[in-house]
Interface confidence: low
């Protein structure tokens, strides 16, 4: 089955740059296939844009000014490209990649899509940094105690752009676990989010990692946020230790190789 | 030109009552083209769900059904048992792939349908409700309840910011909620929820017994004791601290 | 208790626009459905569309696309009805109201909006 | 769009009696989630509406129970077991069934 990936969630570009947008095709030969580009304005229905076919041919869509979008595939690395030139307002939008995928009854086909890349026009010089900056809330004792049951939660504050992607997964799993987010909010000229896990009491002694995708990382690699086990075996204290908590205890924790 | 108008913008559904969503063509006959629909989800996912001639996305069929209505040129699809993994933007579009002619292999697109889920109607639940802390950020988190309107209180003296809640339905088909904000006074910030004429407070879920939950810290993690003498297992910290760690990556 | 309070009556040439507010008070105002109604002197009533802030989707009545425009402001809980291509048939009083959501009653209404269209 | 058509237009009652109000919609109101969106609202003069029946029968928040929705399908009544001085103005029908929404013309109660 043919698979799509724009490893790009967003690209965000100054008046008059040029965009170039990256569609992965896999499980299928990009040179026997043919793959399209759509676009999706705000408000607007998505709109078929451009598209290059098995044998390079390239059909543009009519009304689409000649010269705007470039499409080109590369074999080598099974990558289509839609350049887009002079980037102004009206090109702000997400673009979609997508191919006609045949199923294993004859004449069924299906078109599927890439995740989408979001374009962004700033005329905002932002601090050099604006990458997701993470903080971590570990269960509180209150409901690993009276829930069986722990919630991790991930805050990523002080990103641009807003486009922004978060998993959670369990240290040595490749499974996307079941999680919760909240809406992403404006703060300043920048973003915050949040996205928080719920785990059964048998899962709290696992490590777990909250996997955020933007645009702005590092190295443009998705940035993993580890969360360490919580351990919850009761002990019980003879009252006569006199060992109440005391309001100045505290506790350091230096965790090491967490760095995305 | 062909138009593909969706018949609501947006459809409320509830979870586990069936709902239709209808897509008329205008300006074409619906039988010439071969329908197919989608949903967008949050982060901009366009899945597969339905083509003309019962081939269905993976994982769609059982709950899906799509159809065509020729006499009053309409594509239906309709979604038997929704559950909350169905919220999203439903499109419909057509082409005519296979029907011979030129350039039919591009998709014509109508403008999304906005399903939001609700739970059911169910008894009134109340929730629990815990505070998680990190240095100044403190989160209020309410699981549980049932019906929706809420309103959460992170109780400080020395607000630095609040933001607005997020509110989610819950995997069991209840809501869940998080507050977060930001205090000088984060030890002391308290949280209260007013749901369904009570409040309920987060000191009221407080563990009372004097036991001791974890991190279990690596081999090069430092970790610093109390400076009481009580005789504790030499890698145990006091769970009360938990989530106050800090993290900067 | 919730209100809508909306803004005062209105007077406008045939082709201007005439933009109405309305504000929510004592109550949550993003997850509710605020529809827009009008009524002629001496008519029936007449839903022209309908805004969920919180999602900041408007639907409208076919008699009305392209020449309505809603909007809500979560920040300041009010709506707003813009009607442009005034003419003397849209001489009306502009009611807002919320509904839990379209398919409901519409539960509170504001006091209404005289809007008169003369040249 | 759906027509909603009410009758009578106007109806003429002694304070005390009841008094019937039909409406009919120009298709069925049954929504495919299986429930049947029409209300009714009093409008009195000078007033905005007020919602008193959602849902065909269920009666709003602090409305009379001498107010009671009934009917299915394309045929609705709304019944008022006692009249009472208050009670005048426009009585309007209103479907949110299909989009658009859409009202009756209205029917004028007043007292003999």
């Known amino acids: 089955a043919g698979h799509l990936e724009q490893p790009q969630i967003s690209s965000t570009k100054t008046l008059s740059k040029t965009a170039r947008l990256e569609c992965v095709v896999s499980g299928i030969t990009i040179s026997a296939t043919s793959v399209y580009w759509y676009r999706e304005r705000p408000g607007e229905v998505i709109q078929f844009l451009v598209s290059i076919s098995y044998d390079g041919t390239v059909r543009k869509e009519s009304g689409i000014p000649s010269g705007k979008f470039e499409v080109d595939r590369i074999p080598e690395t099974s990558t289509s490209t839609l350049t887009i030139h002079n980037v102004e307002k009206q090109d702000i939008a997400t673009y979609y990649c997508a191919l006609w995928e045949a199923q294993q009854e004859l004449g069924k086909k299906i078109k599927v899509f890439g995740p989408g890349t979001k374009l962004i026009i700033t005329d905002k010089q932002l601090d050099a940094d604006v990458s997701p900056k993470p903080t971590i809330f570990l269960p509180s004792i209150a409901e690993t105690k009276l829930q069986k049951a722990g919630t991790y939660l991930c805050l990523l504050e002080k990103f641009f752009p807003d486009v922004i992607k978060i998993h959670w997964q369990e240290k040595k799993s490749n499974t996307i676990l079941g999680s919760q987010e909240g809406n992403t909010m404006k703060t300043n000229d920048t973003y915050m989010k949040f996205s928080w896990l719920t785990v059964p009491e048998k899962s709290l002694d696992k490590e777990h990692r909250c996997i955020v995708r933007h645009e702005n990382n590092k190295n443009g690699v998705d940035q993993e946020i580890i969360f360490p086990p919580i351990k919850t075996d009761v002990i019980t204290m003879d009252p006569k230790d006199n060992c109440s908590k005391d309001a100045n205890d505290t506790l350091l924790l230096q965790l090491t190789n967490t760095s995305a | 030109a062909i138009e593909l108008v969706p018949e609501h913008q947006t459809v409320p559904v509830s979870i586990g009552v069936p709902a239709t969503l209808r897509c008329s063509m205008k300006g074409e006959a619906i039988g010439n083209y071969y329908i197919n629909w989608y949903r967008k989800t949050q982060g901009n996912t366009m899945t597969f769900i339905y083509r003309e001639k019962d081939i269905y996305g993976p994982g769609f069929k059982d709950n899906f059904q799509g159809d065509i209505d020729i006499a009053k040129n309409l594509a239906v699809l309709k979604i038997l048992a929704p559950s909350e993994r169905d919220e999203g933007s439903y499109y419909c579009a057509c082409d005519t792939l296979g029907m011979g002619g030129e350039y039919t292999d591009k998709l014509i697109f109508g403008k999304g349908t906005r399903v939001t889920v609700e739970p059911r109607s169910q008894p009134h639940t109340k929730p629990s409700v815990f505070v998680m802390k990190n240095g100044t950020n403190v989160a209020c988190l309410v699981k549980e309840f049932y019906p929706k309107d809420i309103r959460i209180n992170l109780v400080s003296s020395k607000k630095i910011t609040e933001f607005d809640p997020a509110i989610v339905i819950s995997p069991s088909g209840k809501y869940n909620a998080v507050k977060l904000g930001k205090y000088e006074d984060s030890n002391s910030v308290t949280c209260s929820v007013q749901h369904d004429n009570k409040t309920v407070h987060s000191t009221d879920f407080e563990v009372k017994t004097d036991s001791t939950d974890h991190v279990k810290p690596k081999e090069t993690e430092n970790t610093k004791q109390p400076s009481k003498s009580c005789h504790k297992p030499k890698a145990i910290v006091h769970t009360e601290k938990v989530n106050m760690m800090s993290l900067t990556v | 208790e919730v209100q809508l309070v909306q803004s005062g009556a209105e007077v406008k040439k045939p082709g201007s626009s005439v933009k109405v507010s309305c504000k929510a008070s004592?109550?949550?105002?993003?997850?509710?459905?605020i529809s827009w109604v009008r009524q002629a002197p001496g008519q029936g009533l007449e839903w022209m569309g309908g805004i969920l802030p919180i999602l900041s989707t408007a639907n409208y009545a076919q008699k009305f696309q392209g020449r309505v425009t809603i909007t809500a402001d979560k920040s300041t809980s009010t709506a707003y009805m813009e009607l442009s291509s005034l003419r003397s048939e849209d001489t009306a009083v502009y009611y807002c109201?919320?509904?839990?959501?379209?398919?409901?009653?519409?539960?509170?209404w504001g006091q209404g909006t005289m809007v008169t269209v003369s040249s | 769009d759906i027509v909603m058509t009410q009758t009578p237009l106007s109806s003429p009652v002694t304070l005390g009696q009841p008094a019937s109000i039909s409406c009919r919609s120009s298709q069925s109101l049954v929504h495919s989630d299986g429930n049947t969106y029409l209300s009714w609202l009093q409008q009195r003069p000078g007033q905005p509406p007020r919602l008193l029946v959602y849902?065909?029968?269920n009666r709003f928040s602090g409305v009379p129970d001498r107010f009671s929705g009934s009917g299915a399908g394309t045929d609705f009544t709304l019944k008022i077991s006692r009249v009472e001085a208050e009670d005048v103005g426009i009585y309007y029908c209103m479907q949110a069934t299909h989009h658009p929404l859409t009202f009756g013309g209205g029917t004028k109660l007043e007292i003999k």
């Open positions: 004592g109550g949550t105002f993003s997850s509710y459905v």
């Open positions: 109201a919320r509904a839990h959501d379209y398919y409901y009653g519409m539960d509170v």
């Open positions: 849902k065909i029968s």
